[in-house]
Interface confidence: medium
């Protein structure tokens, strides 16, 4: 239904707290360099204006679209051109082009320092002094670093943050209470960020139809007892919600997500028997819980999929008459029977089925042609299954750090032209798949591994798009989203690469490395490993292991030495010489 004032409507639906949080996220995601104070001022102005519209929907400007209102606010910021360069050109455009222009200028890798967590005491002091400002800073800092973070979900993480601080700041040992809990939230939020970015990429590159197919597969796995009409309704609504968030329409997105959660909880009987626990929670927790609810028990009496999609004599007629619906029901039926497959795999199978029908239905004897289609799925299913087995075996053997190093070597060989920081970030993220997925029960491993890897590789593609340097990466990133992971897995050593010359300074270290936190130490060592591979792309695993063991021993020795600086300056050059010899 149309409202006289869109901003008043959203303010009323969302309430002041969520309204302000979402406006802050929106501004922080659009203008990523502005300070918290600058954005907080704008948010207050927008909120005050929304209140005047709530009081009188006919008041001046209350009938304007949210894009117009928000865009006008952003364009009124002083020194926009000095701080944001060509983004200021967006302000010469009219809506909807202006908003599209803002979206195109979102930076997936902004040059901002890492978000450092303050000391426990300092954190608790500022949280107690002003919880609202403290949480505002959190929203601002996360949103500007992750310009596609799913806004209603970021509100959920802020709420988690708030609850942890409330609990831990009352404890005697604040540090040991806060650290593991906040680390947990951070890890989950980072995964949420890459997953959502993948959804926005899907929407941006391949449109709503591609996202809806993803949603049908995912929802059918989770709700195998829901009928196709129900799944389609949920997929359509979920597509709308994600389209809005990816498009920067955060108020509409959060409002529609709340509506979807309400609908699901009111229709549990036709959706799933597993929703009640989620539905008992307050809004943000409820929506979050529903998004990762466990799979419902599969119906016991599902007939073989072949009956309707292979053996039926009307397959080609049915397909020709309404292709999307026919393929949609195939995807629904296959997915509800396979919670043990990744969504990417299910979409590849649906694509294979579609290609088979396109080919076979044009032939003289279609049933003879498409009769073997299910058997032809086998290699497509085996490939990711083997990937999971091989990688989980390697993870169990090496542990997370060693597994990350193995992946780093592999990916540096595949795409040595990619910048070392990007390779290290990618390998560290890809390597976490072991900890995240390999400890799960067998039937949950494949969906966990492949869908997580796909999301990480999407980030690799986004970063590479900014400065394309590797033909290998460009090839894999240009294809469809569901083919990316198999494409990257199939890449081998890039034979076109001219090895980097050996620079001693790349492998020169100083005593300051000794005081770094463990994570930073690992990154330094992994940076050196990537550089070694760039120098010797065909070095054997054994050679690299020798060098890295020597390097670790060197760090250990010098960091324990009484005179660290002398140790580094005398032993460092010896290490470099030994490395060169080992790789010769």
């Amino acid at each position: 239904e149309a409202h006289k004032s869109e901003i008043a409507h959203r303010y009323n639906d969302l309430g002041e707290q969520h309204f302000k949080g979402l406006v802050l996220i929106a501004f922080s995601q659009y203008l990523q360099k502005c300070s918290y104070d600058e954005h907080a001022k704008l948010v207050q102005e927008v909120t005050d204006f929304a209140k005047t519209c709530v009081a009188d929907e006919s008041a001046a400007n209350c009938d304007k679209s949210l894009h117009t209102l928000f865009g006008d606010k952003l364009c009124a910021i002083p020194n926009l051109r000095e701080n944001y360069g060509e983004l200021a050109d967006c302000c010469t455009k009219q809506e909807p082009e202006r908003n599209e222009c803002f979206l195109q200028h979102k930076d997936d890798n902004p040059s901002l320092p890492p978000f450092e967590r303050p000391e426990a005491e300092a954190m608790c002091t500022s949280f107690k002094e002003n919880p609202t400002t403290f949480m505002g800073h959190y929203l601002h800092e996360v949103a500007r670093r992750h310009p596609y973070f799913y806004a209603p979900e970021l509100l959920y993480y802020a709420e988690q943050y708030n609850e942890i601080l409330t609990q831990c700041c009352a404890e005697a040992d604040k540090e040991s209470c806060l650290t593991p809990k906040l680390d947990g939230v951070k890890e989950k939020a980072l995964v949420s960020s890459v997953r959502q970015r993948m959804k926005c990429s899907s929407m941006q590159k391949f449109g709503e139809r591609a996202f809806k197919a993803w949603a049908v597969a995912r929802l059918s796995q989770t709700f195998p007892n829901a009928d196709f009409a129900e799944i389609t309704k949920l997929a359509t609504d979920l597509t709308k919600v994600n389209k809005e968030c990816c498009h920067g329409d955060l108020l509409e997105c959060a409002d529609d997500r709340a509506e979807l959660a309400k609908y699901m909880c009111e229709n549990q009987a036709t959706i799933s028997s597993k929703l009640q626990t989620c539905c008992d929670k307050p809004l943000l927790k409820k929506a979050h819980c529903l998004s990762e609810v466990e799979h419902d028990t599969m119906p016991a009496d599902l007939p073989a999929i072949a009956a309707d999609f292979v053996e039926d004599q009307e397959v080609c007629k049915n397909y020709a008459e309404a292709k999307d619906v026919f393929l949609g029901t195939f995807l629904y039926e296959y997915s509800r029977r396979h919670p043990d497959y990744s969504v990417s795999l299910l979409l590849r199978l649906a694509k294979k089925y579609e290609a088979t029908l396109e080919k076979c239905c044009a032939e003289a004897n279609p049933p003879a042609c498409y009769g073997t289609v299910l058997a032809e799925f086998q290699p497509l299913v085996e490939e990711p299954k083997n990937l999971v087995k091989t990688n989980c075996d390697l993870y169990e053997k090496l542990g997370e750090y060693g597994f990350q190093n193995a992946i780093l070597v592999r990916y540096t060989q595949k795409a040595p032209q990619v910048s070392t920081p990007t390779l290290v970030e990618a390998a560290r993220n890809l390597g976490r798949v072991g900890t995240k997925c390999c400890t799960l029960p067998e039937d949950q491993r494949l969906p966990c591994v492949e869908d997580y890897l796909s999301a990480i590789l999407n980030r690799v593609c986004l970063l590479h798009e900014k400065t394309p340097v590797s033909e290998h990466v460009t090839k894999c990133c240009s294809g469809s989203l569901v083919e990316r992971r198999p494409c990257f897995s199939a890449l081998t050593v890039d034979e076109t690469y001219v090895p980097k010359e050996f620079k001693a300074e790349t492998f020169t270290f100083h005593s300051d490395i000794c005081t770094l936190p463990e994570k930073e130490k690992q990154i330094k060592k992994q940076t050196a490993l990537a550089e070694l591979v760039k120098h010797k792309p065909k070095a054997t695993a054994e050679q690299l292991k020798t060098v890295m063991d020597d390097f670790a021993q060197f760090l250990d020795t010098c960091c324990k030495a009484a005179d660290k600086d002398t140790c580094f300056s005398t032993e460092g050059p010896n290490l470099v010489t030994r490395c060169k010899d080992a790789l010769a």
Epitope: F228, A229, K233, D312, E314, N318, E321, F326, G328
Partner: nanobody
């Protein structure tokens, strides 16, 4: 939620014809078998005719209407039809359209339990 609306009922002389329509609110309607049922005063609701998804696919009729009634569907319009010819006084009833929630592509069932989306009905009266 999928909405189903019947229309086309009315009063007709014995031997006459009527065409009932059943409009569904969503495109996904085409992925389901659908059926027509009827309920005469003081009687149980009974199966009349059914059609599986997609035109040209399986149709099924109750013995009492075989040869006189024809069920069809227009997927582009999200609409199904029941063409009723040579009507008899015993065809007088409220006619209901229903959409199945069984396996999409499955055969139309005669059992009321296999249909989950129902319209409110349209009255058909055949006078002698």
């Amino acid at each position: 939620q999928l909405q189903v609306v019947e229309s086309g009922g009315g009063l007709v002389q014995a031997g006459g014809s009527l065409r009932l329509s059943c409009a569904a609110s969503e495109r996904t309607f085409v992925a389901y078998p659908m059926g027509w049922f009827r309920q005469a005063p003081e009687k149980e609701r009974e199966f009349v005719a059914g059609i599986s998804w997609f035109a040209g696919a399986t149709t099924d009729y109750a013995d009492s209407v075989e040869g006189r009634f024809t069920i069809s569907r227009d997927n582009a319009k999200n609409t199904a039809y029941l063409q009723m010819n040579n009507l008899k006084p015993e065809d007088t009833a409220v006619y209901y359209c229903a959409i199945s929630h069984q396996l999409p592509g499955g055969r139309p069932g005669r059992d009321m339990d296999s249909y989950s989306y129902w319209g409110h009905g349209t009255q058909v009266t055949v006078s002698s």
